[in-house]
Interface confidence: low
């Protein structure tokens, strides 16, 4: 005879477990049923009847075989800055992802638990990294001979249009206007646009040459007179040779100038100095920053002061995205202690016109005996954007998220407690604070 | 006693826009769920679509981008951007009982009489 | 998703028969499923929600039953009054649906 089928409530054999879609009740001491996705355990068994189910009350789900009493709440309705992909039903809970222009700052095992908009570069950056659905817009500098002229979160640097005879020289933030002839670009013309709905897959490309480390002028000479377009006559050669004879003539003479002043207010044996010419903050910001002689400019102790975002954050969900903690501006706390100097201005308050802030780098480079010659000077100033957030170190670090970080840029923060910093170089020079806007 | 009228029905030309109002007496339609459903002549009922007490609205597959359903805090409006013949139907206003979920009710209770549309050239 | 299909389209019962309506649902919907009655010229009247419970004030000769994607409507001791279309409804999801109805059951009272 086939073995009888045993229905539930039934005693397991010694030694075996309760079938599939069923589970043991301690108390009854027999084998039950559970009930399916959607409804939650009304009743629980006994030695002589089976469990009744209930269907799940409104927003709240169960999404497998289960004998749970209370069926679990869905999540909270989404946020504005994200969009519903999954409903709330009986079985499955509601999944919340970020809507385009936004990426996820912070994860959950689901969906997202929070979205911050796409950082955009100003002009004179360009993307370095695109924004994808978990991770910001990575901001760097153009570099010599590239311009970006535009806040957006998907223009990468473009090259300069080259002039047969530069009427403007270009800069990081404006391309190089020609006189009337016709220009030739090192590369296509327009702009270079990355794909904007972003995906966790887009590639990753490093559209321009990082940077060297090498000062860039802000007039930028083309690099010798490219040849005339086809069809066009003229001599160029002279106006040509005039430009660049009286630039480095003015050059040699503020080169020398300078050294001289310097030899006289000094006096001191092979000047090799940095100055960094520092706004005037006020006592509560200045804290921690010390005397242009030092070698190591404005160090101070990461901030500590952001509150958790959500202490009840599960050890899975504590996934934090790549920013930096919030510190004082104008400092990064990096791994091995130094420091690196920005010239970042902190943010204004929403809807005020906060202070703009023009910071000035002036290095002095004198490397002979007599200290007046062979010298060399650099200056970069640039004016602080007031509305300009925190910018990014293009390096990609995964930085825990513990109660005295701060996973993304909130309305919690203070723009006092926001971090601005340049990149992981330590002062490039020449090179403006690497501004990024918020969307 | 609590009841629901639709308005606005009447005869139009295949094109044109098209708004019916839904008015609520004897209850706060704004806290209640209220879907549209419509009714063509001899033809079975075809769900339109929905709109929560929080203002989240659902549509049915093919209804979207065919017709926008609005609330104010006294009605709930069903407009066709551009009818067609085959939208010729009793177009009926329906309460759903108060439920929480996003995207659902548990019944539809109370019904109104209906509001006839039709679309001819 | 989510389509509902009901069977027979039309049925004839005479007066105190038994007229059984059954509906199907393509995925599980739980207990979420609503009957209606619609006779001629009037809006649909709700009979039943949450499968078996019974609306207000309608006579107890309706009953329905059934969990997951099969539901079934039964008019035990059928009268005149009970001729009209019937419709089954899912009232689990409204997101991404093509029609929360069925395509009705006529029911022709001998």
């Known amino acids: 005879l086939p073995a009888q089928v045993a229905f539930t409530p039934y005693a397991p054999e010694p030694g075996s477990t309760c079938r599939l879609r069923e589970y043991y009740d301690q108390t009854a001491q027999m084998c039950c049923s559970k009930c399916s996705p959607g409804q939650h355990a009304k009743v629980f068994c006994t030695k002589t009847s089976d469990t009744v189910c209930d269907s799940c009350e409104d927003s709240t789900y169960t999404q497998l075989w289960n004998w749970v009493p209370e069926c679990l709440s869905c999540g909270s309705r989404c946020s504005s800055d994200q969009v519903e992909t999954q409903a709330c039903t009986r079985e499955q809970n509601r999944i919340c992802t970020c809507r385009p222009g936004w990426y996820c700052a912070l994860s959950k095992q689901e969906g997202c638990r929070l979205c911050a908009p796409l950082r955009k570069c100003r002009p004179g950056f360009g993307v370095a990294r695109p924004g994808t659905e978990t991770s910001d817009v990575v901001c760097k500098p153009c570099a010599p001979g590239t311009f970006s002229n535009t806040t957006s979160s998907t223009d990468i640097c473009r090259p300069h249009q080259i002039c047969n005879v530069v009427a403007i020289p270009g800069n990081a933030s404006m391309d190089a206007v020609c006189t009337s002839t016709s220009p030739t670009r090192s590369m296509a013309p327009g702009a270079v646009h990355l794909p904007q709905p972003v995906s966790t897959r887009s590639q990753h490309t490093q559209p321009t040459p990082e940077p060297s480390t090498a000062p860039s002028t802000s007039f930028l000479l083309p690099m010798g007179p490219s040849p005339p377009a086809e069809g066009s006559t003229g001599d160029f050669a002279l106006p040509v040779g005039l430009i660049v004879g009286v630039t480095a003539l003015g050059l040699l003479i503020i080169g020398v100038v300078n050294c001289v002043i310097m030899t006289q207010v000094k006096k001191k044996p092979l000047c090799l100095q940095r100055e960094a010419k520092v706004p005037h903050l006020p006592a509560d910001k200045a804290r921690g920053t010390q005397g242009p002689e030092q070698q190591h400019l404005l160090i101070t102790a990461p901030s500590s002061s952001s509150s958790s975002l959500e202490s009840s954050a599960s050890a899975l969900d504590r996934r934090a995205p790549t920013r930096n903690q919030p510190q004082a501006p104008g400092v990064e706390a990096s791994g091995a202690g130094e420091a690196r100097a920005s010239t970042g201005s902190s943010d204004s308050s929403p809807g005020g016109h906060g202070t703009q802030v023009n910071v000035t780098c002036i290095v002095n480079v004198c490397s002979s005996s007599d200290h007046s010659s062979q010298c060399s000077s650099q200056a970069s100033s640039t004016m602080g954007d007031t509305d300009s957030s925190p910018s990014e170190s293009p390096k990609d670090e995964q930085v825990p998220f513990s109660k005295e970080e701060c996973a993304f840029r909130s309305q919690l923060e203070t723009p006092e407690t926001l971090l601005g910093s340049t990149e992981e170089k330590p002062l490039p020079l020449g090179v403006p604070d690497a501004g990024m806007k918020p969307s | 006693q609590e009841q629901l009228k639709e308005s606005g029905g009447r005869l139009v030309t295949p094109g044109t826009p098209l708004t019916l109002t839904c008015t609520a007496s004897g209850f706060s339609l704004s806290s209640y769920y209220v879907s549209w459903v419509r009714q063509a002549p001899g033809k079975g009922l075809e769900w339109i679509g929905i709109i929560h007490s929080d203002g989240s609205i659902y549509y049915a597959t093919w209804a979207k981008g065919l017709f926008t359903i609005s609330r104010t805090s006294t009605t709930v409006d069903l407009k066709a951007t551009s009818l067609t013949t085959e939208d010729t139907a009793t177009y009926f206003c329906?309460?759903?009982?108060?439920?929480?979920?996003?995207?659902?009710?548990?019944?539809?209770?109370?019904w109104g009489q209906g509001t006839l549309v039709t679309v001819s050239s | 998703a989510y389509d509902m299909t009901q069977t027979p389209a039309s049925v004839e019962v005479a007066v105190g028969g038994t007229v059984t309506i059954k509906c199907q649902a393509s995925?599980?919907?739980?207990?979420?499923l609503s009957w209606y009655q619609q006779k001629s010229g009037q809006p649909p009247k709700l009979l039943i929600y949450?499968?078996?419970t019974l609306a207000s004030g309608v006579p107890s000769r309706f009953s329905g039953s059934g969990s997951g994607t099969e539901f079934t409507l039964t008019i035990s001791g059928v009268e005149c009054d009970d001729a009209a279309t019937y419709y089954c409804?899912?009232?689990?999801?409204?997101?991404?649906?093509?029609?929360?109805f069925g395509g009705g059951t006529e029911v022709v009272v001998k």
């Open positions: 409804q899912q009232g689990y999801t409204t997101n991404n649906v093509d029609n929360l």
């Open positions: 995925q599980t919907i739980s207990n979420e």
């Open positions: 329906v309460r759903g009982y108060p439920g929480y979920y996003t995207s659902t009710f548990n019944r539809l209770d109370l």
């Open positions: 949450r499968a078996s």
